[in-house]
């Protein structure tokens, strides 16, 4: 029951996380104009991974996509790639995990198969979450670096005639959405991996056991060979010289939950 709950919760958390990663990737507010210490209040700029937007003081907002690949910074391309890889891996993970759910029966799928699928989806969710966190962090680092560079420029340019005024950009809402979503996907993946351990069946030792009476009532097959159980053939054809229960390979075995008399 706990395994089913852990698996189900892991699936739901990952689903929310991947939805968040998709939302963050599509959002326009990855970088927004810093309103504090902003010399130009008439214009408000904000950028996403796919397009740039500007809102005028009149309320008019215009967005335009980055339809070129060549003129874009390499970092932006890297962030796009990380987010897309995260979404693709997450989507595949979700697909796999649906079939792996313990509460869903598909034909005669064994628990071992479900355990493997749960582990696979868990690993995919973990990598997906890490990709999203990495992508958002790379973009954030790019903003932070530029923010402090622009701050230095603002103050070094104060002596004498300032030729160019720089408006700084800060973290947009998409970065926070991305971080949280990546974290949720990661947590969901870990939960799926934990659930996998509970789903995996215990290793069973199907060793043949011969049960026979001790003392005078020893049953012999013609030819003096020991009768074999249903678990494999008695290839060794070893004679019984003493009473008690022995396995085929003469190793002492104790009755388990899988042995039926």
């Amino acid at each position: 029951m706990a395994v089913t709950a852990c698996q189900g919760l892991g699936f739901v958390v990952s689903l929310i996380g991947i939805a968040g990663i998709i939302a963050a990737t599509c959002m326009d507010q990855w970088s927004t104009q810093d309103l504090y210490n902003n010399p130009v209040t008439a214009v408000f700029n904000y950028q996403g991974l796919w397009r740039s937007c500007v809102r005028e003081s009149s309320g008019f907002t215009e967005c335009r996509g980055y339809f070129t690949l060549l003129g874009l910074p390499a970092m932006l391309q890297a962030v796009r790639a990380l987010m897309i890889v995260g979404i693709v891996l997450g989507a595949i993970g979700l697909l796999v995990s649906i079939f792996a759910l313990k509460c869903i029966r598909i034909g005669s799928m064994e628990d071992s198969a479900k355990a493997n699928m749960t582990l696979t989806s868990g690993i995919m969710f973990i990598v997906s979450g890490l990709c999203a966190i990495a992508g958002v962090s790379v973009f954030a680092n790019m903003l932070v670096t530029n923010f402090w560079m622009s701050t230095a420029n603002m103050y070094t340019g104060m002596g004498g005639m300032v030729q160019t005024v720089q408006t700084r950009y800060t973290f947009g809402a998409a970065l926070f959405v991305g971080w949280v979503a990546g974290g949720l996907t990661l947590i969901g993946g870990v939960m799926m991996c934990i659930a996998c351990r509970g789903l995996a069946p215990e290793e069973t030792n199907y060793k043949a056991v011969s049960y026979h009476a001790s003392g005078h009532s020893v049953a012999y097959k013609p030819g003096g060979f020991k009768a074999s159980t249903g678990f494999g053939s008695n290839t060794k054809n070893k004679k019984i010289y003493d009473g008690g229960a022995r396995t085929e390979d003469e190793v002492q075995s104790y009755p388990s939950k899988h042995d039926y008399v």
Epitope: V54, Y66, T68, G71, L76, M142, L143, N146, Q166, Y169
Partner: nanobody
Framework: QVKLEESGGGLVQAGGSLRLSCAAS????????MAWYRQAPGKQRDLVAR???????TYAESVKGRFTISRDNAKNTVYLQMNNLKPEDTGVYYC?????????WGQGIQVTVSS
């Protein structure tokens, strides 16, 4: 350090023409758009025209049909061709360039249209 250098301003008669140019120099890359804004005395800065990297430019209603913005992406330069100028076009014209992580503004250039 990035610099935006504006040129081409001055005094002109109503109905006349002027061509403003703005060149971005320094370590600037990945410009999304370059634009011209106008600030009339005692008023706030308003958009005149914006040239995006791709697609058609954007114009303020008051200058449509009279002003033309063009951009040389290779030189990181934007031009504003102003025809049939009116006294209300008087003001300080600011050039701006916008990138993924920063916005840059020139020091402005005075354009005066006398009637």
């Amino acid at each position: 350090q990035v610099k935006l250098e504006e040129s081409g301003g001055g005094l002109v008669q109503a109905g006349g023409s002027l061509r403003l140019s703005c060149a971005a120099s320094g370590s600037i890359s990945g410009i999304n758009y370059m634009a011209w804004y106008r600030q009339a005395p005692g008023k706030q800065r308003d958009l005149v025209a914006r040239a995006w990297t791709t697609g058609p430019p954007t114009y303020a209603e008051s200058v449509k049909g009279r002003f033309t913005i063009s951009r040389d992406n290779a030189k990181n330069t934007v031009y504003l061709q102003m025809n049939n100028l009116k006294p209300e076009d008087t003001g300080v014209y600011y050039c701006t360039a916008n990138t993924l992580t920063s916005g840059y503004w020139g020091q402005g250039i005075q354009v005066t249209v006398s009637s």
